[in-house]
């Protein structure tokens, strides 16, 4: 049994840090697999972590962690049984991807505003929850040429977007996703997106 | 109630052995690191040894490596101390103390919250 | 190793007067914010060691209000605001970051 890509680690700088790897060949990962980890730190313990199947030869394993800080290095063993297949260490500090932004909701009664609001997914005590900028994806599904990234650089997780640039009579869906400039971490995911139809029309003098 | 009591102490001749105990009662005895600390007569107080809640992970001083060993049976909720090649620098009442929470993925600490009453070891030929 | 230093050895008081004893580490102590791996004891004569301050500025329970902790990095203080006769002793502070763990060498606080 053999490693094929050493694990890569991500830390979602809350609870979690995720790492995916891939096998020389077909693994069953749950079964097969342990990855074991240990924050270098005085009188801590050895936990275990169950990876998952992530295709045929990928896993991925889920680390379940306190909260992070800076000075936090793990040291990762991954075993197959008695036999140790790769030694590594993780500073989820330095390797970090946002949790998404949730409760995306699109808000049409605002006059000729379509406003957007979403939640940050940090609480206010996280070292993240001041750090995050967004970008808003809106596309049309009726018309594939439309698609439009809106970066949010301001911490407060709203967009108003002039209902008159968008076309009339025709559904658009957004989504969202953020990352933290001082953290120099990568973009989360994307939301779930949200859909909506653009019934603004622009007042008859205007037309 | 939350109490540590050791037992063991006494006098050896230098080159002798004690194994001194620290029972724990009133906490969950196997959530938690422990830590042994020494008091020479009329000095200060010396770090001797730790040791996490599960056992797997152990500390010691370099002036008493190689010749401590600490253990526990979390099963009898008890800590260990064996002391072999005992010196006369080694004469020091020796006390037991609870240490951080350990089974957290970053050990919790509280401070070494908890101390037992203290056993004499005097080592003289 | 972590080197503590203590700082006066001996310091008499009268009674109902503040009190500080600093501590000096060789290195930080702080591992993250607000958390400083540093521990004050009290040790009264014929008796166990017993807790009073960790983490730097955390009364431990039972503690009376007049103890404080502060400082951070590598210098720390205990303050004692107003001195009672039950509080003589030993005074140490320890660091708790990693071993060895490793004790001041002690302040002798007596009554004038």
């Known amino acids: 049994m053999k490693v094929l890509q050493e694990p890569a680690c991500v830390s979602d700088y809350m609870s979690i840090s995720t790492c995916e790897w891939k096998m020389g060949g077909p693994t069953n990962c749950s079964a097969e697999l342990r990855l074991l980890y240990q924050l270098v730190f005085q009188s801590s313990e050895t936990h275990t972590c169950v990876p998952e199947n992530n295709g045929g030869v990928g896993c991925v394993c889920h680390l379940l962690m306190d909260d992070v800080v800076s000075m936090d290095n793990y040291t990762l063993d991954l075993w197959a049984g008695q036999q140790l297949l790769w030694k590594g260490s993780f500073k989820p500090s330095e390797h970090v991807k946002p949790r998404a932004p949730g409760n995306l909701t699109v808000h049409t009664n605002v006059s000729d505003t379509v406003l957007l609001t979403w939640s940050n997914p940090y609480p206010p005590d996280n070292y993240l929850y001041n750090d995050l900028t967004y970008a808003v994806n809106i596309w049309s599904e009726n018309d594939p040429a439309y698609s439009r990234i809106h970066n949010v650089t301001y911490l407060k997780p709203t967009l108003r977007i002039p209902a008159s640039t968008l076309k009339s009579g025709i559904s658009y869906r957004a989504r969202v996703r953020a990352w933290a400039q001082h953290y120099n971490t990568t973009w989360s995911e994307w939301s779930p997106s949200t859909k909506w139809y653009n019934s603004y029309r622009e007042p008859f003098e205007q037309r | 109630e939350v109490q540590l009591v050791e037992s063991g102490g006494g006098l050896e001749q230098p080159g002798g052995s004690l194994r001194l105990s620290c029972a724990g009662s009133g906490f969950t005895f196997r959530d938690f690191a422990m830590t042994w600390v020494r008091q020479a007569p009329g000095k200060g107080l010396e770090w001797v040894s730790s040791?996490?809640?599960?056992?797997?992970?152990?500390y010691y001083a370099d002036s008493v490596k190689g010749r401590f060993t600490i253990s526990r049976d979390n099963s009898k909720n008890t800590l260990y101390l064996q002391m072999n090649s005992l010196r006369a620098e080694d004469t020091a009442v020796y006390y037991c103390?609870?240490?951080?929470?350990?089974?957290?993925?970053?050990?919790?600490?509280?401070?070494?919250?908890?101390w037992g009453q203290g056993t004499t070891v005097t080592v003289s030929s | 190793d972590i080197v503590m230093t203590q700082s006066p050895l001996s310091l008499p008081v009268t009674p109902g007067e503040p009190a500080s004893i600093s501590c000096r580490s060789s290195q930080s102590l702080l591992y993250s914010i607000g958390k400083n791996y540093v521990d004050w004891y009290l040790q009264k004569s014929g008796q166990s060691p017993q807790l009073l301050i960790y983490l730097g500025n955390k009364r431990a329970s039972g503690v009376p209000d007049r103890f404080s902790g502060s400082g951070s990095g590598t210098d720390f203080t205990l303050k004692i605001s107003r001195v009672e006769a039950e509080d003589v002793g030993f005074y140490y502070c320890m660091q708790s970051l990693q071993t060895p763990y490793v004790f001041g060498q002690g302040t002798k606080l007596e009554i004038k």
């Open positions: 103390a609870k240490d951080r929470v350990s089974i957290t993925i970053r050990p919790r600490y509280y401070g070494l919250d908890v």
């Open positions: 040791i996490s809640g599960s056992g797997d992970n152990i």
